[in-house]
Protein backbone atom coordinates (compact mmCIF):
# COMPACT_ATOMS: atom_id res chain seq x y z
CA UNK A 1 0.00 0.00 0.00
CA UNK A 2 1.41 3.44 -0.78
CA UNK A 3 2.60 4.87 2.55
CA UNK A 4 0.53 8.05 2.26
CA UNK A 5 -2.72 6.18 1.55
CA UNK A 6 -4.60 5.68 4.80
CA UNK A 7 -5.57 2.18 5.84
CA UNK A 8 -9.32 1.95 5.85
CA UNK A 9 -11.31 2.09 9.06
CA UNK A 10 -13.90 -0.07 7.34
CA UNK A 11 -11.43 -2.43 5.69
CA UNK A 12 -13.61 -3.90 2.97
CA UNK A 13 -12.32 -1.60 0.23
CA UNK A 14 -8.61 -1.73 1.03
CA UNK A 15 -7.89 -4.92 -0.88
CA UNK A 16 -4.30 -5.95 -1.54
CA UNK A 17 -2.68 -8.77 -3.44
CA UNK A 18 -0.11 -11.23 -2.05
CA UNK A 19 2.68 -8.66 -2.43
CA UNK A 20 0.78 -6.01 -0.50
CA UNK A 21 0.04 -3.95 -3.61
CA UNK A 22 -3.36 -2.30 -3.87
CA UNK A 23 -5.69 -4.48 -5.93
CA UNK A 24 -7.40 -2.48 -8.66
CA UNK A 25 -10.96 -3.31 -9.69
CA UNK A 26 -11.89 -4.70 -13.06
CA UNK A 27 -14.21 -3.36 -15.73
CA UNK A 28 -17.55 -5.03 -16.38
CA UNK A 29 -20.52 -4.50 -18.59
CA UNK A 30 -23.14 -3.08 -16.24
CA UNK A 31 -26.59 -2.66 -17.78
CA UNK A 32 -28.55 -4.47 -15.07
CA UNK A 33 -31.52 -6.22 -16.72
CA UNK A 34 -32.27 -5.60 -20.40
CA UNK A 35 -34.42 -7.38 -22.94
CA UNK A 36 -32.32 -9.59 -25.20
CA UNK A 37 -32.54 -11.27 -28.59
CA UNK A 38 -29.90 -13.84 -27.63
CA UNK A 39 -31.45 -17.27 -28.15
CA UNK A 40 -30.26 -20.66 -29.46
CA UNK A 41 -26.75 -19.39 -30.16
CA UNK A 42 -23.34 -20.72 -29.12
CA UNK A 43 -22.38 -17.25 -27.92
CA UNK A 44 -23.84 -13.77 -27.79
CA UNK A 45 -22.64 -10.24 -27.28
CA UNK A 46 -24.31 -8.42 -24.43
CA UNK A 47 -25.26 -5.36 -26.52
CA UNK A 48 -24.66 -3.40 -23.33
CA UNK A 49 -23.02 -0.05 -24.04
CA UNK A 50 -22.20 0.69 -20.40
CA UNK A 51 -18.82 -0.38 -19.05
CA UNK A 52 -18.28 0.43 -15.38
CA UNK A 53 -15.41 0.24 -12.96
CA UNK A 54 -16.53 -2.26 -10.34
CA UNK A 55 -17.11 -0.68 -6.95
CA UNK A 56 -14.94 -3.16 -5.06
CA UNK A 57 -11.64 -4.68 -6.22
CA UNK A 58 -12.78 -8.20 -5.34
CA UNK A 59 -15.83 -8.02 -7.60
CA UNK A 60 -16.06 -9.99 -10.82
CA UNK A 61 -18.27 -9.69 -13.90
CA UNK A 62 -21.57 -11.56 -13.99
CA UNK A 63 -24.11 -12.22 -16.73
CA UNK A 64 -27.53 -13.77 -16.18
CA UNK A 65 -29.65 -14.98 -19.11
CA UNK A 66 -33.31 -15.75 -18.44
CA UNK A 67 -36.05 -16.99 -20.72
CA UNK A 68 -39.71 -17.43 -19.84
CA UNK A 69 -42.98 -17.60 -21.80
CA UNK A 70 -42.97 -13.85 -22.34
CA UNK A 71 -39.41 -12.66 -22.95
CA UNK A 72 -35.66 -13.12 -22.79
CA UNK A 73 -33.53 -10.89 -20.59
CA UNK A 74 -29.80 -10.49 -20.05
CA UNK A 75 -28.47 -9.00 -16.85
CA UNK A 76 -24.89 -7.67 -16.65
CA UNK A 77 -23.36 -6.53 -13.34
CA UNK A 78 -20.34 -6.57 -11.04
CA UNK A 79 -20.66 -8.81 -8.00
CA UNK A 80 -18.56 -10.06 -5.09
CA UNK A 81 -17.98 -13.80 -5.61
CA UNK A 82 -17.98 -14.38 -1.86
CA UNK A 83 -21.69 -13.57 -1.90
CA UNK A 84 -24.40 -15.56 -3.68
CA UNK A 85 -26.14 -13.98 -6.64
CA UNK A 86 -29.76 -14.93 -7.37
CA UNK A 87 -29.19 -17.51 -4.60
CA UNK A 88 -26.34 -19.19 -6.49
CA UNK A 89 -22.61 -19.29 -5.70
CA UNK A 90 -20.35 -17.89 -8.43
CA UNK A 91 -18.33 -21.08 -8.91
CA UNK A 92 -16.50 -19.91 -12.05
CA UNK A 93 -15.49 -16.44 -10.86
CA UNK A 94 -11.79 -16.99 -11.64
CA UNK A 95 -12.47 -17.85 -15.29
CA UNK A 96 -11.31 -15.30 -17.88
CA UNK A 97 -14.37 -16.11 -20.01
CA UNK A 98 -18.07 -16.02 -19.21
CA UNK A 99 -19.17 -19.63 -19.73
CA UNK A 100 -22.90 -19.94 -19.16
CA UNK A 101 -24.13 -22.73 -16.89
CA UNK A 102 -27.78 -23.62 -16.45
CA UNK A 103 -29.30 -23.26 -12.99
CA UNK A 104 -32.57 -24.68 -11.76
CA UNK A 105 -35.25 -22.00 -11.46
CA UNK A 106 -38.95 -22.84 -11.58
CA UNK A 107 -40.92 -21.37 -14.45
CA UNK A 108 -37.98 -20.22 -16.54
CA UNK A 109 -34.75 -21.19 -18.22
CA UNK A 110 -31.92 -19.62 -16.24
CA UNK A 111 -28.23 -19.45 -17.16
CA UNK A 112 -25.51 -17.62 -15.27
CA UNK A 113 -21.79 -17.03 -15.72
CA UNK A 114 -19.06 -15.06 -13.98
CA UNK A 115 -15.52 -14.17 -14.99
CA UNK A 116 -12.53 -12.09 -13.97
CA UNK A 117 -11.12 -10.20 -16.94
CA UNK A 118 -12.05 -6.74 -18.15
CA UNK A 119 -15.46 -6.63 -19.85
CA UNK A 120 -15.57 -10.43 -19.98
CA UNK A 121 -19.36 -10.44 -19.52
CA UNK A 122 -19.72 -8.74 -22.89
CA UNK A 123 -19.28 -12.09 -24.65
CA UNK A 124 -21.39 -14.83 -23.11
CA UNK A 125 -20.72 -18.40 -24.17
CA UNK A 126 -23.31 -21.18 -24.12
CA UNK A 127 -21.42 -23.74 -26.20
CA UNK A 128 -20.78 -26.98 -24.29
CA UNK A 129 -17.33 -27.41 -25.84
CA UNK A 130 -16.04 -24.50 -23.73
CA UNK A 131 -17.34 -26.02 -20.53
CA UNK A 132 -15.14 -29.10 -20.71
CA UNK A 133 -12.31 -29.01 -23.19
CA UNK A 134 -11.24 -25.40 -23.70
CA UNK A 135 -8.42 -24.43 -21.30
CA UNK A 136 -8.72 -20.68 -21.95
Amino acid sequence: IPPHVQKSVNNDMMVTDNNGAVKFPQLCKFCDVRFSTCDNQKSCLSNCSITSICEKPQEVCVAVWRKNDENITLETVCHDPKLPYHDFILEDAASPKCIMKEKKKPGETFFMCSCSSDECNDNIIFSEEYNTSNPD
Epitope: A21, V22, F24, L27, I53
Partner: nanobody, 122 residues
Framework: EVQLLESGGGLVQPGGSLRLSCAAS???????QMWWVRQAPGKGLEFVS?????????YYANSVKGRFTISRDNSKNTLYLQMNSLRAEDTAVYYC???????????????WGQGTLVTVSS
Protein backbone atom coordinates in the same frame (compact mmCIF):
# COMPACT_ATOMS: atom_id res chain seq x y z
CA GLU B 1 12.16 8.14 -11.18
CA VAL B 2 8.39 8.14 -11.72
CA GLN B 3 6.68 11.10 -10.07
CA LEU B 4 3.00 12.04 -9.97
CA LEU B 5 1.91 15.35 -8.45
CA GLU B 6 -1.76 16.20 -8.01
CA SER B 7 -3.14 19.72 -7.72
CA GLY B 8 -6.42 21.59 -8.01
CA GLY B 9 -8.13 20.45 -4.84
CA GLY B 10 -9.86 22.81 -2.46
CA LEU B 11 -13.15 23.81 -0.88
CA VAL B 12 -16.17 23.98 -3.17
CA GLN B 13 -19.92 24.33 -2.56
CA PRO B 14 -22.34 21.54 -3.44
CA GLY B 15 -23.21 21.75 -7.13
CA GLY B 16 -19.90 23.39 -7.93
CA SER B 17 -17.02 22.28 -10.14
CA LEU B 18 -13.30 21.63 -9.80
CA ARG B 19 -10.62 20.41 -12.17
CA LEU B 20 -7.83 18.28 -10.75
CA SER B 21 -4.49 17.93 -12.49
CA CYS B 22 -1.79 15.29 -12.15
CA ALA B 23 1.61 16.28 -13.50
CA ALA B 24 3.69 13.24 -14.46
CA SER B 25 7.43 12.94 -14.89
CA UNK B 26 10.09 10.25 -15.11
CA UNK B 27 8.36 8.12 -17.74
CA UNK B 28 6.88 8.29 -21.22
CA UNK B 29 3.43 9.71 -20.56
CA UNK B 30 0.59 8.35 -22.63
CA UNK B 31 1.64 4.71 -22.71
CA UNK B 32 -0.03 3.26 -19.61
CA GLN B 33 -3.30 3.01 -17.72
CA MET B 34 -3.92 6.07 -15.56
CA TRP B 35 -6.44 6.22 -12.74
CA TRP B 36 -8.06 8.66 -10.36
CA VAL B 37 -8.69 7.02 -6.99
CA ARG B 38 -10.20 8.72 -3.96
CA GLN B 39 -10.33 8.09 -0.25
CA ALA B 40 -12.98 9.72 1.92
CA PRO B 41 -12.13 10.35 5.59
CA GLY B 42 -12.10 7.05 7.49
CA LYS B 43 -13.11 5.06 4.40
CA GLY B 44 -11.42 2.75 1.93
CA LEU B 45 -10.25 3.51 -1.57
CA GLU B 46 -12.81 4.22 -4.28
CA PHE B 47 -11.63 3.82 -7.86
CA VAL B 48 -13.21 6.74 -9.67
CA SER B 49 -11.99 6.75 -13.26
CA UNK B 50 -9.54 5.15 -15.65
CA UNK B 51 -8.11 6.18 -19.03
CA UNK B 52 -6.30 3.72 -21.26
CA UNK B 53 -3.56 4.29 -23.76
CA UNK B 54 -3.32 3.94 -26.66
CA UNK B 55 -6.83 4.83 -27.72
CA UNK B 56 -7.81 6.93 -24.75
CA UNK B 57 -10.85 4.86 -23.75
CA UNK B 58 -12.33 6.16 -20.52
CA TYR B 59 -14.19 4.40 -17.72
CA TYR B 60 -16.01 5.58 -14.61
CA ALA B 61 -17.44 4.27 -11.37
CA ASN B 62 -21.23 4.36 -11.33
CA SER B 63 -21.11 6.91 -8.49
CA VAL B 64 -19.50 9.60 -10.70
CA LYS B 65 -20.75 8.68 -14.17
CA GLY B 66 -22.14 11.72 -16.00
CA ARG B 67 -20.53 14.16 -13.53
CA PHE B 68 -16.79 13.50 -13.81
CA THR B 69 -14.62 13.47 -16.94
CA ILE B 70 -11.10 12.06 -17.13
CA SER B 71 -8.72 13.27 -19.83
CA ARG B 72 -5.03 13.51 -20.57
CA ASP B 73 -2.75 15.92 -22.42
CA ASN B 74 0.25 13.93 -23.58
CA SER B 75 2.09 17.07 -24.73
CA LYS B 76 1.93 18.42 -21.17
CA ASN B 77 2.41 15.06 -19.43
CA THR B 78 -0.72 15.80 -17.44
CA LEU B 79 -3.81 13.85 -16.40
CA TYR B 80 -7.03 15.71 -15.55
CA LEU B 81 -10.27 15.06 -13.71
CA GLN B 82 -13.07 17.52 -14.40
CA MET B 83 -15.60 17.25 -11.56
CA ASN B 84 -19.03 18.83 -11.99
CA SER B 85 -22.21 18.79 -9.87
CA LEU B 86 -20.13 18.04 -6.81
CA ARG B 87 -21.80 16.52 -3.75
CA ALA B 88 -20.82 16.28 -0.09
CA GLU B 89 -20.07 12.58 -0.62
CA ASP B 90 -17.36 13.52 -3.15
CA THR B 91 -15.27 14.90 -0.27
CA ALA B 92 -12.03 12.90 -0.28
CA VAL B 93 -8.33 12.91 -0.98
CA TYR B 94 -7.93 12.31 -4.70
CA TYR B 95 -4.90 10.36 -5.92
CA CYS B 96 -3.72 9.77 -9.44
CA UNK B 97 -2.14 6.40 -10.10
CA UNK B 98 -0.27 4.86 -13.00
CA UNK B 99 -0.43 1.16 -13.81
CA UNK B 100 2.47 -0.16 -15.82
CA UNK B 101 2.43 -3.74 -17.12
CA UNK B 102 5.23 -5.81 -15.61
CA UNK B 103 6.33 -7.95 -18.56
CA UNK B 104 3.96 -10.59 -19.92
CA UNK B 105 2.90 -11.91 -16.50
CA UNK B 106 -0.38 -9.98 -16.48
CA UNK B 107 0.79 -8.17 -13.36
CA UNK B 108 1.32 -4.43 -12.96
CA UNK B 109 3.67 -2.05 -11.21
CA UNK B 110 1.70 0.80 -9.65
CA UNK B 111 2.82 4.35 -8.93
CA TRP B 112 0.84 6.78 -6.79
CA GLY B 113 0.81 10.53 -6.28
CA GLN B 114 0.59 12.16 -2.85
CA GLY B 115 -3.03 13.23 -3.29
CA THR B 116 -5.01 16.47 -3.25
CA LEU B 117 -7.90 17.16 -0.86
CA VAL B 118 -11.34 18.03 -2.21
CA THR B 119 -13.90 19.29 0.31
CA VAL B 120 -17.51 19.79 -0.79
CA SER B 121 -19.37 21.80 1.81
CA SER B 122 -21.64 24.80 2.14
Amino acid sequence: EVQLLESGGGLVQPGGSLRLSCAASGFTFGTDQMWWVRQAPGKGLEFVSRIDSPGGRTYYANSVKGRFTISRDNSKNTLYLQMNSLRAEDTAVYYCAKRQPAGVSGKYVDYWGQGTLVTVSS
